[in-house]
């Protein structure tokens, strides 16, 4: 990805998805009526013109927000602590990798706008998730809906990272 982002970053992202999957506590079949449109900003991860700074910023903010969401008293009460600790550790490692990378990308002169804009959009999205959890009184079903939503958005963000990686590979081989 044009910086010292380790090859295992993609693996860490997949591990995060696996952990989120394992964290399931109740059957999602019981929670259909609690579905909500959180309006994940798809346009942010679907574009074909991927800038390194944009991808790094989206991933960094996503992981930062997931870390914050699952690093609260409410979250500790809702989830298996062993899995939660593993999630925190994995997210912390990924954030460290990305921060190193972001510093280099900024140093290479990529625009600050490409970094600040996705961050603001994602903060609004996660604020909507927090409001929903509060509104639903942090019920098991509310957490289950949020877990599934985060798996979906993280999956889309990881896909964006893979697309940039393969684009870089194509450029490197041509």
């Amino acid at each position: 990805l044009g910086c010292d982002l380790p090859q295992n970053h993609g693996l860490l992202s997949r591990n995060t998805l696996v952990l989120l999957h394992q964290m399931r506590r109740i059957s999602p079949f019981l929670c259909l009526k609690d579905r909500r449109d959180f309006r994940f900003p798809q346009e942010m991860v679907k574009g074909s013109q991927l800038q390194k700074a944009h991808v790094m910023s989206v991933l960094h903010e996503m992981l930062q927000q997931i870390f914050s969401l699952f690093h609260t008293e409410r979250s500790s009460a809702a989830w298996n602590m062993t899995l939660l600790d593993q999630l925190h550790t994995g997210l912390h490692q990924q954030l460290q990798h990305l921060e190193t990378c972001l510093l280099q990308v900024v140093g290479e002169g990529e625009s600050a706008g490409a970094i600040s804009s996705p961050a603001l959009t994602l903060r609004r999205y996660f604020q909507g998730i927090r409001v929903y959890l509060k509104e639903k009184k942090y019920s098991d079903c509310a957490w289950e809906v949020v877990r599934m939503e985060i798996m979906k958005s993280l999956f889309l963000s990881t896909n964006m990272q893979e697309r940039l990686r393969s684009k870089d590979r194509d450029l490197g081989s041509s």
Partner: antibody, heavy 121, light 107 residues
Framework: EVQLVQSGAEVKKPGESLKISCKGS????????IGWVRQMPGKGLEWMGI????????AYSPSFQGQVTISADKSISTAYLQWSSLKASDTAMYYC??????????????WGQGTLVTVSS | DIQMTQSPSSLSASVGDRVTITCRAS??????LNWYQQKPGKAPKLLIY???SLQSGVPSRFSGSGSGTDFTLTISSLQPEDFATYYC?????????FGQGTKVEIK
């Protein structure tokens, strides 16, 4: 392109067993649930049950509980509907369809082409 | 289980007519209601989801409304390809349930 491709038509005798399939492609198979729907000749749609292929969690309509078994093999992106002992009244068209689970997206947006099951002595 | 009741069970109409089909749930299902169209020998096709959202690729003459227990599917100007059977389905809670269907025939 998203596709659900079902196995071909079956002609069976009462008391025989049967397993029909529904193969998903063009999307992340474990990110969607697969539902099964029955349509008896000249009748309406009846919801049978659903499976989450990511962990094979299932739920059935009370009318079909104990009558059929729904399963999935995520390694080959395929869901199954099976009977251990068919009856003449199982004669119908069976459809599979994908469901987005708890994600906010269209329900049952893609359907298989249907599998016609005929049970006759 | 939630019962879904559609009316009418069949109707005759002409090309260009405005057609309305109603669906009533035995208890509140919020906006978790879908409408499907089915033609003979074909799989059902999703038209409307979450009561009023038009599925991608479906003509804008189809619209849905309602919430709670009472829902409506409207075809603003019936086209020859719209003669089919229409089903409502609730996805608020399992088991999902369908209405009995409304057959739209040519007058």
């Amino acid at each position: 392109e998203v596709q659900l491709v079902q196995s071909g038509a079956e002609v069976k005798k009462p008391g025989e067993s049967l397993k029909i399939s529904c193969k998903g492609s063009g999307y992340s198979f474990t990110s969607y649930w697969i539902g099964w729907v029955r349509q008896m000749p000249g009748k309406g749609l009846e919801w049978m049950g659903i499976i989450d292929p990511s962990d094979s969690d299932t739920a059935y309509s009370p009318s079909f509980q104990g009558q059929v078994t729904i399963s999935a093999d995520k390694s080959i992106s395929t869901a199954y509907l099976q009977w251990s002992s068919l009856k003449a009244s199982d004669t119908a068209m069976y459809y599979c369809a994908r469901h987005p689970g708890l994600n906010w997206a269209p329900d049952f947006d893609y359907w298989g082409q249907g599998t016609l099951v005929t049970v006759s002595s | 289980d939630i019962q879904m009741t559609q009316s009418p069970s069949s109707l005759s109409a002409s090309v260009g007519d405005r057609v309305t089909i109603t669906c009533r749930a035995s208890q509140s299902i919020s906006k978790f209601l879908n409408w499907y169209q089915q033609k003979p020998g074909k799989a059902p096709k999703l038209l409307i989801y979450f009561a009023s959202s038009l599925q991608s690729g479906v003509p804008s003459r189809f619209s849905g409304s309602g919430s709670g227990t009472d829902f409506t599917l409207t075809i603003s100007s019936l086209q020859p390809e719209d003669f089919a059977t229409y089903y409502c389905q609730q996805s608020n809670t399992l088991p999902f349930t369908f209405g009995q269907g409304t057959k739209v025939e040519i007058k």
